[in-house]
């Protein structure tokens, strides 16, 4: 149709930052400060600090890590953003009052094995899923 | 060992809120304001709003939804929290300077089908994954 042809021709008028954002083809050159960008940070959790030392036998603690940082427009590809996060970032960029920025959260988590006492004081070895952050991304 | 027995006997001295947090057994009675808790919110995104109307033919827009709200201690089970989020919430509760609270992010996302013009003005029908928030949780 003429409308379709018109729209097809109009595409060159679309702002570059939006054109580049064709769903998952995320702009590489982020304007947000790289030091502040969403990434994995060190965090060692001691079970004593959590007050769990009396029922967890081993380990004494573990490297849990955590995610923190900006998920600002435009998102870099290393930010493991979902298509929804890309759309939300753009909505926030257009009007920050409408939605918050996507948040920096774990995208991959690993398990740890824990030796602990159950309620009957039996010693149990159990694998706890999703305990360690392996990677972070914008969600 | 005597140490183990001692620790086993000491378990009753562990504060209730921490005992209840044995990994994924999350306390049901949240003290944080329910209205502010992490949940799914309405958000309709028109492709015109994003400036994409010249290359997206259909749909005109879609119900994207978004996640927003508090992930405060103790986490309710409906908050779909990972074990890591439970640990992070407790670390934050003990010392807010150490780590941020976990963030409210999509836990389930759905796809949508989009009819659009490619760079050669061909009409393409493509399924874009992770475009619609189906559920939110604390991560």
């Amino acid at each position: 149709s003429t409308g379709s042809k018109q729209r097809s021709q109009n595409r060159s008028k679309t702002p570059k930052n939006q054109e580049a954002l064709r769903m998952a083809n995320v702009a590489e050159n982020s304007s947000s400060d790289q030091r502040q960008a969403c990434k994995k940070h060190e965090l060692y959790v001691s079970f004593r600090d959590l007050g769990w030392q009396d029922w967890i036998i081993a380990p004494e603690g573990y490297a849990a890590y955590y995610c923190e940082g900006e998920c600002a427009f435009p998102l870099n590809s290393y930010m493991n953003a979902t298509n929804h996060a890309i759309v939300q970032t753009l909505v926030h960029f257009i009007n920050p009052e409408t939605v918050p920025k996507p948040c920096c959260a774990p995208t991959q988590l690993n398990a740890i094995s824990v030796l602990y006492f159950d309620d009957s004081s039996n010693v149990i070895l159990k694998k706890y899923r999703n305990m360690v952050v392996r990677a972070c991304g914008c969600h | 060992s005597t140490g183990s027995k001692q620790r086993s006997q000491n378990r009753s001295k562990t504060p209730k809120n921490q005992e209840a947090l044995r990994m994924a057994n999350v306390a049901e009675n949240s003290s944080s304001d329910q209205r502010q808790a992490c949940k799914k919110h309405e958000l309709y995104v028109s492709f015109r709003d994003l400036g994409w109307q010249d290359w997206i033919i259909a749909p005109e827009g879609y119900a994207a939804y978004y996640c927003e709200g508090e992930c405060a201690f103790p986490l309710n089970s409906y908050m779909n929290a990972t074990n890591h989020a439970i640990v992070q919430t407790l670390v934050h509760f003990i010392n807010p300077e150490t780590v941020p609270k976990p963030c409210c992010a999509p836990t389930q996302l759905n796809a949508i089908s989009v009819l659009y013009f490619d760079d050669s003005s061909n009409v393409i029908l493509k399924k874009y994954r992770n475009m619609v928030v189906r559920a939110c949780g604390c991560h």
């Epitope: 909505v91 009007n95 | 309405e42 709003d49």
Partner: nanobody, 121 residues
């Protein structure tokens, strides 16, 4: 919470103009879609016009070229300028704020109490 209060309704002759106002309190209006709907006796609530969070305007077919929506963020108020009014524009006009589908009243979370517009021939 957003509280909405409409004003500016009244009786006007066909071909005349009216300006409706919708003042928001409790929270800023600017992050929401601001929509005007109308309801004539015994009829469904009908979409009139919406101003998106992006600043883009969406008009219902029956009011295109006659009605204009605008927003004053400083005053936290949305206006509906109605020109070339027709008797069929007679209805209670409601202002809504939400983030759902702009043409569907179910996409709006907050509503005003409505203001009556009567167009006489």
């Amino acid at each position: 919470e957003v509280q909405l209060v409409e004003s500016g309704g009244g009786l006007v002759q066909a071909g005349g103009s009216l300006r409706l106002s919708c003042a928001a309190s409790g929270r800023t209006f600017s992050g929401y879609v601001a929509g005007w709907f109308r309801q004539a006796p015994g009829k469904e609530r009908e979409f009139v016009v919406a101003l998106s969070w992006s600043g883009i305007t969406y008009y219902g077919d029956s009011v295109k070229g006659r009605f204009t929506i605008s927003r004053d963020n400083g005053k936290n108020t949305v206006y509906l300028q109605m020109n070339s009014l027709k008797p069929e524009d007679t209805a209670v006009y409601y202002c809504g704020a939400g983030k759902g589908y702009y043409k569907d009243y179910r996409g709006y979370d907050y509503w005003g109490q409505g203001t009556q517009v009567t167009v006489s021939s």
